[in-house]
């Protein structure tokens, strides 16, 4: 026998209370798919989240995260604070970079500059805060022999960053 | 959306190498850091090191230092996890996660085995 | 590094507050999160920084963080709740994420 709740469209729900008929989900909440027998309570966006798509009787609420703060985990689940490049988020609040590590990101940690001298190059242009170091040619006296294998990740000093 | 994508299971003898991948998609994969956690049989989550992608800068917890060798391409937008001499002791799943601090999504996690 | 310890095991009855602790030297100086793992399943955020909720988790659970430790509590626990919980933190001293031993939460009955 066929289930009669499998009638209910989207939007609605079979109310048991009403002899399994389907009654309209009722305001602040949803049903995306049919034969349900209940509807889901829409998502709510406060504090840092804001509202990116309304709930709708079919959809739940979207949020995003108001400015200021960056999206985390499935469907904007979480919001993040920004920082500045050349900054890594703390704590206790945005830091700068210490001597020797960038961030070129608004979110992120520091990460050291690349240490050019152990690809046997000389620093081409010297980093800052928000860049890395940009490396050049191989320094003076340096023979491609002496390492014919490039190492597959920067080489760099470990840097030190804020508390 | 966002998915993380782990290679399959493997099982390994003792001393044979492994290359295990972790691929992204669904997001800016250069930017974002990828961190791999190992979770031995009926044990607790260890983070083993962490890669971001955009210049493959590495940092490897202590105790993983010199044991494993964590990469990435983002060409192809996949982060790598390799041993060049497998143990017993390696046998546990190994899962990849984006990010440093919170881990926002995780891959579905990559069984190995090394058994003689 | 920081080390961060949980309890092995924490029993609770259906309706009533669980509470797991993760304790490290200082542990408030640094953001905590917390991570719900079930049999066979990847960890989720279910706290992050101390005391936020990701929209999806139940309001029954929250954080705290000070000193030298941080506690998940979750309130009115329901049989579903049943699963791993694991403390992590961020340390700027060697730039690393460690995490607690784990603690297996039983829902009696």
């Known amino acids: 026998l066929q289930d009669p709740c499998s009638n209910c469209p989207a939007g609605t729900f079979c109310d048991n209370n009403r002899n399994q008929i389907c009654s309209p989900c009722p305001p602040n909440s949803f049903s995306s798919a049919g034969g349900q027998r209940t509807c889901d309570i829409c998502r709510q966006c406060k504090g840092v989240f804001r509202t990116r798509k309304e709930c709708s009787s079919t959809s739940n609420a979207e949020c995003d995260c108001t400015p200021g703060f960056h999206c985390l985990g499935a469907g904007c689940s979480m919001c993040e604070q920004d920082c500045k490049q050349g900054q890594e988020l703390t704590k206790k609040g945005c830091k700068d970079c210490c001597f020797g590590t960038f961030n070129d990101q608004k979110r992120g940690i520091c990460r050291p500059w690349t240490n050019c001298s152990l690809d046997g190059k000389s620093v081409l242009v010297n980093g800052t805060k928000e860049r890395d170091v940009v490396c050049g040619p191989a320094s003076a006296g340096f023979s491609p022999g002496t390492s014919s294998v490039t190492p597959p990740a920067p080489a760099r000093e470990p840097g030190h960053s804020p508390q | 959306q966002v998915q993380l994508v782990q290679s399959g299971a493997e099982v390994k003898k003792p001393g044979e190498s492994l290359k295990i991948s972790c691929k992204g998609s669904?997001?800016?994969?250069?930017?974002?850091?990828i961190s791999w956690v190992r979770q031995m049989p009926g044990k607790g989550l260890e983070w083993m090191g962490k890669?971001?992608?955009?210049?493959?800068?590495?940092n490897y917890s202590p105790s993983f230092q010199g044991q494993v060798t964590i990469s990435a391409d983002k060409s192809i937008s996949t982060a790598y996890l390799q041993w060049s001499s497998l143990k017993a002791s390696d046998t546990a799943m190994y899962y990849c996660?984006?990010?440093?601090?919170?881990?926002?999504?995780w891959g579905q996690g990559t069984l190995v085995t090394v058994s003689s | 590094d920081i080390e961060l310890t949980q309890p092995p095991s924490v029993s609770v009855a259906p309706g009533q507050t669980a509470r797991i602790s993760c304790s490290g030297d200082?542990?408030?100086?640094?953001?905590a999160h917390w991570y719900q793992q079930k049999p066979g399943q990847a960890p989720v955020v279910v706290i992050y920084?101390?005391?936020n909720r990701p929209s999806g988790i139940p309001e029954r659970f929250s954080g705290s963080n000070s000193g030298n430790t941080a506690t998940l509590t979750i309130s009115g626990t329901q049989a579903e709740d049943e699963a791993d919980y694991y403390c992590?933190?961020?340390?700027?001293?060697?730039?690393?994420?460690?995490f607690g031993g784990g603690t297996k939460l039983t829902v009696l009955g």
């Open positions: 920084q101390d005391k």
């Open positions: 996660a984006r990010g440093y601090g919170i881990f926002d999504y």
């Open positions: 890669i971001y992608p955009g210049d493959s800068y590495t």
């Open positions: 992590s933190t961020y340390t700027f001293v060697g730039f690393t994420t460690v």
């Open positions: 669904g997001y800016s994969f250069s930017t974002y850091w």
């Open positions: 200082n542990i408030g100086d640094q953001y």
